[in-house]
Interface confidence: low
């Protein structure tokens, strides 16, 4: 139809800095670059209806839906959302195109739905339909990447079945040990799905999307490295692909590599070899063992042998379900006020765990490190010497694990006192939990040496503050002590603290603190 206007629909995402509801506007805010929403004529609809591509918005994001109309003469417009009409003010840009905008600030569920824009120009009437929905992150997944061999090529493909589709990158390192940490200069990252350079020391593939980042390391046996004291172990679940790389370097090409499973050579099609000369003219060979989908009978000792190197093996264990193995009994620690100390949990898990450390309802990031014996360890050192209960929580696709720790800080008691008409109470949070004495100060005992034993009630650890125990002692008022100064003292192996209380009448009491080490 020659009379139809040329229209363009765009989405503008804004950096959030406002907090009102959706409004029709002729003043778009400062924003990121507009995204073309297509706006195609909708088939099988009565009248002229353009439909923009569906718009997905994060909760609390701010956007502008904008229509640019290339039609002669004036235009008038009306927005309709959920059967309500919204004011519409078109304006004209420098190219004399009509511009109509709808600003939605701080997106909420109530602002999701169909936005209809009715435009009337001198030539024709038409409708533009925008569908705005809130991005449903509950449907998002992030799965650990796995490897596949490229057909007819010596290359590996990295695949992560995640939603939204993740960015896949290879993380390569040619050094040993600590220098292969993620941000080390020895680490090279390649944002590619396919990797041809398979001779490196350490090869990992990582996938990242809105949910985070998951990595898989290419399991490697290096025949030129001294074997670990314990046999390396690789866990896989039934149906997952198995990949083991055997690597060896020799002065010349006169050597070969072979894979065996439980002393039987691997079948053809379950391995492939690559070789190259290194810069110093030595020959590097790598031999991959792979099974596209493992079954229980693929469990066993995989041995890589060379005609010029000692053999090395790895134990591959195929499990039906993932697991987390660790002792979950709670552990109590007592340390000095300035002593360096870290909580640590040693565990064996497959697939890799996600974990957190928690203290007083606050979560802390959790780092894990692989040990040579197939175990991993997570340490937490950021306790800032705060006594209390610390929780380590770990989970993977199939298992959950929680372990409790109590941290006690050895210190001299600090005493707080309070009194009422009928009793006086003292509290202390020192550790080890203190013992209490009450003393009466009188003419006969100006140094307060006369011990009170009657009417004293000690409660150990009666109040738990985030796992921190508090001890208290209460003295019931009797005629014998009314009007006298009394002293409560808390003592443990690190010292003594006292507080003096005047037992006269109810009301604010003067307290005199005494610190005796």
């Amino acid at each position: 139809n020659q009379d139809l206007p040329v229209i363009k629909c765009v989405l503008i995402n804004h950096k959030n800095n406002d907090s009102s509801v959706g409004k029709s506007s002729s003043y778009p805010m400062v924003s990121e670059s507009p995204e073309d929403l297509g706006c195609a004529l909708r088939p099988q609809s009565s009248g002229t209806v353009y439909e923009a591509a569906a718009v997905e918005v994060d909760v609390s994001a701010s956007i502008t839906l904008q229509v640019l109309v290339d039609a002669p003469g004036n235009i008038s417009c009306l927005w309709v959302f959920k059967h309500s009409s919204l004011n519409c003010q078109p304006h004209f840009d420098l190219q004399n195109r009509g511009v109509v905008s709808m600003v939605i600030l701080k997106m909420t569920e109530t602002q999701a739905g169909e936005y209809l824009l009715f435009i009337q120009s001198e030539a024709t009437n038409y409708t533009i339909l925008f569908t705005v929905s809130i991005r449903n992150t509950l449907l998002y997944t992030l799965r650990r990447p796995y490897f596949r061999k490229m057909e007819n090529q010596d290359a590996l493909v990295c695949i992560s079945e995640s939603v939204p589709e993740p960015i896949v990158e290879w993380v390569l390192c040619d050094s040993q040990g600590e220098s292969c940490k993620e941000e080390s200069p020895a680490v090279v990252k390649k944002e590619e799905k396919v990797l041809h350079e398979l001779f490196g020391t350490d090869i990992r593939c990582c996938a990242r999307n809105e949910l985070g980042r998951e990595c898989t390391r290419l399991f490697t046996i290096d025949l030129n490295q001294t074997p670990q004291t314990t046999l390396p172990q690789l866990f896989l679940k039934v149906g997952e692909p198995l990949w083991i790389r055997c690597k060896a370097v020799h002065v010349n090409h006169g050597f070969g590599l072979t894979w065996e499973l439980e002393n039987k050579a691997l079948e053809e099609g379950n391995y492939f070899e690559m070789s190259t000369y290194s810069t110093n003219r030595t020959m590097i060979r790598i031999l991959f063992a792979f099974v596209s989908s493992v079954a229980r009978n693929d469990t066993g000792y995989y041995t890589c042998s060379s005609s010029k190197h000692p053999s090395q093996s790895a134990l591959v264990t195929i499990v039906e379900k993932g697991f987390i193995n660790a002792t979950n009994s709670s552990e109590d620690y007592e340390i000095d006020q300035y002593e360096e100390f870290c909580f640590s949990v040693r565990f064996k898990a497959y697939p890799q765990i996600r974990c957190t450390w928690t203290f007083s309802r606050k979560s802390f990031p959790c780092e894990q490190k692989g040990l040579d014996n197939g175990y991993s360890i997570s340490k937490f050192c950021n306790h800032k010497h705060q006594p209390g209960e610390y929780i380590f929580h770990a989970e993977n696709d199939d298992a959950q694990f929680t372990k409790m720790f109590t941290l006690n800080i050895r210190r001299k008691p600090q005493v707080l006192a309070e009194a009422s008409a009928s009793q006086a109470s003292c509290f202390s949070d020192g550790y080890p939990l203190p013992s209490w004495t009450w003393k009466k100060c009188s003419d006969k005992s100006p140094n307060c040496t006369e011990e009170i034993t009657e009417g004293v009630w000690n409660r150990k650890a009666n109040r738990k503050v985030f796992g921190q125990w508090v001890s208290s002692s209460t003295l019931n008022m009797s005629e014998a002590i009314k009007g006298f100064l009394v002293k409560c003292c808390a003592y443990n192996s690190l010292g003594t603290s006292c507080e003096t209380i005047l037992l006269n009448s109810p009301g604010p009491f003067p307290f005199i603190q005494d610190n005796i080490s």
Partner: antibody, heavy 120, light 107 residues
Framework: QVQLVQSGAEVKKPGASVKVSCKAS????????MHWVRQAPGQGLEWMGW????????GYAQRFQGRVTMTRDTSTSTVYMELSSLRSEDTAVYYC?????????????WGQGTTVTVSS | DIQMTQSPSSLSASVGDRVTITCQAS??????LNWYQQKPGKAPKLLIY???ILQSGVPSRFSGSGSGTDFTLTISSLQPEDFATYYC?????????FGQGTKLEIK
């Protein structure tokens, strides 16, 4: 040879659901992703989602999220695509398509297509 | 979502002609672009994947090139069976999107 055979044409009322099947033969069913693509009359191709027949994992285009479900039966090498809350705009030919061994290298084998008509 | 824009939307040519169809992506898609041919009433057929690799069984008169955002499908010498609609498709990130199609007709 590698083949994908789809179920026959369907006529549905708005609001109803349709379940289209796609039977694979001539290759290892669990080694290749399966995609679903639709084509409205006189229109272009629109990708709906993927399924990994080995794991059962799926990924759907956002515009079909909540309305589409892809399942598989490995014993019969069949994948299914169910679309619910049908509307007239869902009238289209629905194709299943086998992925190249590397899912990002396109769809190398297609079913013959299943025509779904949504009309009151 | 990544938008794919094909041009031209239709094209008239004669047997023996050299024909070029272009496809532009709204974002960098590296080399993850595929080309399909579709004849009326039939399912699409994969011609080229990874921007330039010819699918087995496809005649060598078809070729593809490009990387990043700009891609080209070339038919070096049109044959009668080549008159059809051609679609480009990105497989860089989901949702995988197709171009709107280029209809190649006999002049």
């Amino acid at each position: 040879q590698v083949q994908l055979v789809q179920s026959g044409a369907e006529v549905k009322k708005p609001g109803a659901s349709v379940k289209v099947s796609c039977k694979a033969s001539g290759y290892t069913f669990t080694n290749y992703y399966m995609h679903w693509v639709r084509q409205a009359p006189g229109q272009g191709l629109e990708w709906m989602g993927w399924m990994n027949p080995n794991s059962g994992n799926t990924g759907y285009a956002q515009r079909f999220q909540g309305r589409v479900t892809m399942t598989r039966d490995t014993s019969t090498s069949t994948v299914y695509m169910e679309l619910s809350s049908l509307r007239s705009e869902d009238t289209a030919v629905y194709y299943c398509a086998k992925s190249h061994y590397y899912y990002f290298y396109g769809m190398d084998v297609w079913g013959q297509g299943t025509t779904v008509t949504v009309s009151s | 979502d990544i938008q794919m824009t094909q041009s031209p939307s239709s094209l008239s040519a004669s047997v023996g002609d050299r024909v070029t169809i272009t496809c532009q992506a709204s974002h960098d898609i590296s080399k993850y672009l595929n080309w399909y041919q579709q004849k009326p009433g039939k399912a699409p057929k994969l011609l080229i994947y990874a921007a330039s690799i010819l699918q087995s069984g496809v005649p060598s008169r078809f070729s593809g090139s490009g990387s990043g955002t700009d891609f080209t499908l070339t038919i070096s010498s049109l044959q009668p069976e080549d008159f059809a609609t051609y679609y480009c498709q990105q497989s860089y990130s989901t949702p995988y999107t197709f171009g709107q199609g280029t209809k190649l007709e006999i002049k």
